[in-house]
């Protein structure tokens, strides 16, 4: 978590700042959503527990050609300690449940806000 905050970041970003920035990006997505997000693409639902940043990235990375979530994908990769590529799945996916990207983002946003409120940044 030392180099989060985008390519223009002048130096290490505190974990609380990185989480706040991710939350702000998800808020932007939900606010600016006019047409169905990512054309209504479906992604695997995840368990919002430990390791969920990687699981979230593994779900969202399978959505291609959706510029609205590209920044989110980059930010999530900063929270995930290993490299994630399309087609990769962790045990945190609820493999029998697919949801729209918009609902996925909404659920993730609420959970991250709770983590921020509780001071759990990593």
């Amino acid at each position: 978590l030392t180099c989060l905050g985008g390519f223009a970041s002048p130096g290490p970003v505190p974990p609380s700042t990185a989480l706040r920035e991710l939350i702000e990006e998800l808020v932007n997505i939900t606010q600016n959503q006019k047409a169905p997000l990512c054309n209504g693409s479906m992604v695997w639902s995840i368990n919002l527990t430990a390791g969920m940043y990687c699981a979230a990235l593994e779900s969202l990375i399978n959505v291609s050609g959706c510029s609205a979530i590209e920044k989110t994908q980059r930010m999530l990769s900063g929270f995930c300690p290993h490299k994630v590529s399309a087609g990769q799945f962790s045990s945190l996916h609820v493999r029998d449940t697919k949801i729209e990207v918009a609902q996925f983002v909404k659920d993730l946003l609420l959970h991250l806000k709770k983590l921020f409120r509780e001071g759990q940044f990593n």
Epitope: R20, V27, T30, L48, L110, H111, K113, K114, F116
Partner: antibody, heavy 125, light 112 residues
Framework: QVQLVQSGAEVKKPGSSVKVSCKAS????????MHWVRQAPGQGLEWMGT????????KYVPKFQGRVTITADESTSTAYMELSSLRSEDTAVYYC??????????????????WGQGTLVTVSS | DIQMTQSPSSLSASVGDRVTITCRSS???????????LEWYQQKPGKAPKLLIY???DRFSGVPSRFSGSGSGTDFTLTISSLQPEDFATYYC?????????FGQGTKLEIK
């Protein structure tokens, strides 16, 4: 509209337990924290604890630890507070309250914005 | 536990008066995330409390602009700029930054 409706008044014997319910409507309880606060007759407010109904995580005041259990049932949108080993000093009005977030602000923790009507629990032999 | 001490414990004032209630915490209540979860509640006899102010100075929706909050660190203030008849009640400060979260003992605002 948002409402928190609590169960009715209770009279209990010392040493027994009481379970107070708080039924939510107008919002999803998984999007909130649900809190319990009590107020002894003529006294101030005392926060007892909270639950995140999305995962069941709880926080309690140490003085109640082991005697209080806060639970939530997402399917019925109801939060519960059970207090055991009751003593006369537990006579109080017990309130539930929620804290919620909205989707449109990055930092929007709204504190205890809606409260139940209160449940009077009287502990008497 | 963090103690929240309000002063005064009771206060007599008249309609139109400017009233200030202070709340002091026994230690700094800045949360690890940088926010300060200091809140003010109003309670009338036989009724549930109502949220007035959250995060020191954010007014909750529907709360009249005559209510304002300020402060930082350990010292906080609730100000009512011009008392109205419906403002006579008991006011509580509350910190939600460090578990266990705690209320002040209350300030009873009475009609002079």
């Amino acid at each position: 509209q948002v409402q928190l409706v609590q169960s009715g008044a209770e009279v209990k014997k010392p040493g027994s337990s009481v379970k107070v319910s708080c039924k939510a409507s107008g919002f999803y309880i998984k999007d909130t924290y649900m809190h319990w606060v009590r107020q002894a007759p003529g006294q101030g407010l005392e926060w007892m604890g909270t639950i995140d109904p999305a995962n069941g995580n709880t926080k309690y005041v140490p003085k109640f630890q082991g005697r209080v259990t806060i639970t939530a049932d997402e399917s019925t949108s109801t939060a519960y507070m059970e207090l055991s080993s009751l003593r006369s000093e537990d006579t109080a009005v017990y309130y539930c309250a929620r804290s919620i977030y909205d989707d449109y602000h990055a930092d929007d923790y709204y504190a205890m914005d809606y409260w139940g009507q209160g449940t009077l629990v009287t502990v008497s032999s | 536990d963090i103690q929240m001490t309000q002063s005064p414990s009771s206060l007599s004032a008249s309609v139109g008066d400017r009233v200030t209630i202070t709340c002091r915490s026994s230690q700094n209540i800045v949360h690890i995330n940088g926010n300060t979860y200091l809140e003010w509640y109003q309670q009338k006899p036989g009724k549930a409390p109502k949220l007035l102010i959250y995060k020191i100075s954010d007014r909750f929706s529907g709360v009249p602009s005559r209510f304002s909050g300020s402060g930082s660190g350990t010292d906080f203030t609730l100000t009512i700029s011009s008392l109205q008849p419906e403002d006579f009640a008991t006011y509580y400060c509350f910190q939600g930054s460090h578990v266990p979260w705690t209320f002040g003992q209350g300030t009873k605002l009475e009609i002079k």
